[in-house]
C-alpha cells in the first residue's frame, strides 16, 4: 500500500503523489483526514471523508448515523456503507404498514387468506398478502377498460363454449340435449331439454337467437315448432356480446381497477 518514502524521481518529486510498488504507478496522496476510495487515487475526487463505523457520508458530505434494525420486527436488508445508510425491512412473515427513511415505522403480520380465498400474491416485506377467490370468477377487460368478471359455466346444464380471455368473457351454452329457453349475455339463463321432432319439421320460434326472449314451452299434448339440428350438431345458444353482467348464482361484481394492475382482493379489504 502507500509507501512512507515515495520514489521522488518516479513521481517527479511531487509531494502530492507517492509511488505505490503494488500497482507500480504514482498515486495521489489524499490530504490529511481524507481517505482514498481506491487503492491508487489519481485525483482529489478519489479521496473522501471517513466516517466512524455505523455512520455514512450523506449527499451533503456530512457523516450521518446509519439507521439501526434493532427492533424485533426488523431485519437488515442492506448494510451500512461508507456512502449509504443501512436499510431495514420487516422480518419474514411481516409487511411494512408505515414506512420510514431506510426503515419501517410499523410492521404487521401478513394476513392469512380467509375461507374461500387463496393466495394470489404472497406477502413481502413491503406488501401484505393478496388474496383471491378460491374458484371463479376470473376477469377480462371490457370495452370500457374495466376489469369485469367472466361468466361462469358451472351450472350442470351449461358447458363452456369459449374460454375466458384477457379481452373477452367466457361464453357458455346449454349442454348437448338441451336448448336455451332464456338467453343471457354470454350464457343462457335457462336451459330446457331439446324437443324431439320428426325430421324436416317446422320452423324455430321467431328471432330466437337474436333476441333475449323467453321460449314458452307449448301446452302439453301439442307438438312444438322444431328446428333442424344445426350443421355442427350443436343446439343454438345466444352468444351476443353485449356488455352487461350475467346475474345468476355465480354473478360477480365489476371491479374498477386500473387496466395495468393485476386484479386481486386483499383480505384486509384494502
Amino acid at each position: 500500500f502507500p509507501q512512507d518514502r515515495p520514489f521522488e524521481d518516479t513521481c517527479h518529486g511531487n509531494p502530492s503523489h507517492y509511488y505505490d510498488k503494488a500497482v507500480r504507478r504514482c498515486c495521489y496522496r489524499c490530504p490529511m483526514g481524507l481517505f482514498p476510495t481506491q487503492q491508487c487515487p489519481q485525483r482529489p475526487t478519489d479521496c473522501r471523508k471517513q466516517c466512524e463505523p455505523d455512520y455514512y457520508l450523506d449527499e451533503a458530505d456530512r457523516c450521518t448515523a446509519c439507521v439501526t434494525c434493532s427492533r424485533d420486527d426488523l431485519v437488515e436488508k442492506t448494510p451500512c456503507a461508507w456512502n449509504s445508510s443501512r436499510v431495514c425491512e420487516c422480518r419474514p412473515g411481516m409487511f411494512c404498514s408505515t414506512s420510514a427513511v431506510n426503515s419501517c415505522a410499523r410492521c404487521f403480520f401478513h394476513s392469512v387468506c380467509p375461507a374461500g380465498m387463496i393466495v394470489k400474491f404472497p406477502g413481502t416485506a413491503q406488501k401484505n398478502t393478496v388474496c383471491e377467490p378460491a374458484s371463479e370468477p376470473d376477469y377480462y377487460l371490457d370495452e370500457a377498460g374495466r376489469c369485469t368478471a367472466c361468466v361462469s359455466c358451472s351450472r350442470d346444464d351449461l358447458v363452456e363454449k369459449t374460454p375466458c380471455a384477457w379481452n373477452s368473457s367466457r361464453t357458455c351454452e346449454c349442454r348437448p340435449g338441451m336448448i336455451c329457453a332464456t338467453s343471457a349475455t354470454n350464457s343462457c339463463a335457462r336451459c330446457v331439454p331439446y324437443p324431439i321432432c320428426a325430421a324436416e319439421t317446422v320452423t324455430k320460434p321467431q328471432d330466437m337467437a337474436e333476441k333475449d326472449t323467453t321460449f314458452e314451452a307449448p301446452p302439453l299434448g301439442t307438438q312444438p315448432d322444431c328446428n333442424p339440428t344445426p350443421e355442427n350438431g350443436e343446439a343454438p345458444a345466444s352468444t351476443s356480446p353485449t356488455q352487461s353482467l350475467l346475474v345468476d348464482s355465480q354473478a360477480s361484481k365489476t371491479l374498477p381497477i386500473p387496466t395495468s394492475a393485476p386484479v386481486a382482493l386483499s383480505s384486509t379489504g384494502k
Partner: antibody
C-alpha cells in the same frame, strides 16, 4: 468518552532517539487520522506529523527524515519515533485526533521531551 | 516565524467584545477552513471554532469566527475572566497543518 494518553517523553541527548506513544480510547481509532503537535516552552503550537489511511504519512519540513509516525489499529495506539534529536525538538508533544473539516477535535495532556546534553 | 500571523496579545475588560485577527495566504486560509483553539494556562489546547465559524457543542455562543479572503478573526463578546488564555488560529495547507503564533488574551480588572 474520547481519551488520548501520551507517554514515552523524557530527557535525551542531542542525536539520540525516543519513541512516543499515544493510547486512544472512547472512539473507533482506525477511522480517524491522528497527529502529533508540539509546543516548545513558552512558545506556540507547531504541527509535527500526521497519519491517515492506512499508512499515509505527513510531516512538517522541520522533522522530515528524522521522525516517523505510525499506528497500530489493533492496539489503538499512535507512535512517533524520533531520531537524530536536536535541542530545538525540546517541547511538550501532544497527540491529537484529526477529523477532516473539524480539525484537531481532541487532544491528549501532552508528554515533555527534553533534548539536552 | 509562523505562517499565520496573529497579534501577540489582546486585552479587554469583563463584558467587553474583543477581536483577534489571523492573517495568512491563498495557500492556507484563502483555500481552506480556519480553526481556532483555546489553551488555558497549563492545559492542552481545545477546539473552539471549526469550519471558519462553527462551534463544537459545549462552546458558548459568545465565541464566533469569521473568514474573508486570506484573513480570519475570532470575536469574543461578553468577555469573562475565564476567557483569559492563549488563542491560536490554524489552517490546512496542502500536506501540512499550520498554526498562528498565538495571541495571549488578558482580561483586565
Amino acid at each position: 468518552e474520547v481519551q488520548l494518553l501520551e507517554s514515552g517523553g523524557g530527557l535525551v541527548q542531542p542525536g539520540g532517539s525516543l519513541r512516543l506513544s499515544c493510547a486512544a480510547s472512547g472512539f473507533t481509532f482506525s477511522s480517524y487520522s491522528m497527529s502529533w503537535v508540539r509546543q516548545a516552552p513558552g512558545k506556540g503550537l507547531e504541527w509535527v506529523s500526521g497519519i491517515g489511511y492506512p499508512y499515509y504519512t505527513y510531516y512538517a519540513d522541520s522533522v522530515k527524515g528524522r521522525f516517523t509516525i505510525s499506528r497500530d489499529n489493533s492496539k489503538n495506539t499512535l507512535y512517533l519515533q524520533m531520531n537524530s534529536l536536536r535541542a530545538e525538538d525540546t517541547a511538550v508533544y501532544y497527540c491529537a485526533r484529526y477529523y477532516y473539516d473539524y480539525g484537531f477535535d481532541y487532544w491528549g495532556q501532552g508528554t515533555l521531551v527534553t533534548v539536552s546534553s | 516565524q509562523s505562517v499565520l500571523t496573529q497579534p501577540p496579545s489582546a486585552s479587554g475588560t469583563p463584558g467587553q467584545r474583543v477581536t483577534i485577527s489571523c492573517s495568512g495566504s491563498s495557500s492556507n486560509i484563502g483555500s481552506n477552513y480556519v480553526y481556532w483553539y483555546q489553551q488555558l494556562p497549563g492545559t492542552a489546547p481545545k477546539l473552539l471554532i471549526y469550519r471558519n465559524n462553527q462551534r463544537p457543542s459545549g462552546v458558548p455562543d459568545r465565541f464566533s469566527g469569521s473568514k474573508s479572503g486570506t484573513s480570519a478573526s475570532l470575536a469574543i463578546s461578553g468577555l469573562r475572566s475565564e476567557d483569559e488564555a492563549d488563542y491560536y488560529c490554524a489552517a490546512y495547507r496542502s500536506y501540512d497543518y499550520v498554526f498562528g503564533g498565538g495571541t495571549k488574551l488578558t482580561v483586565l480588572g
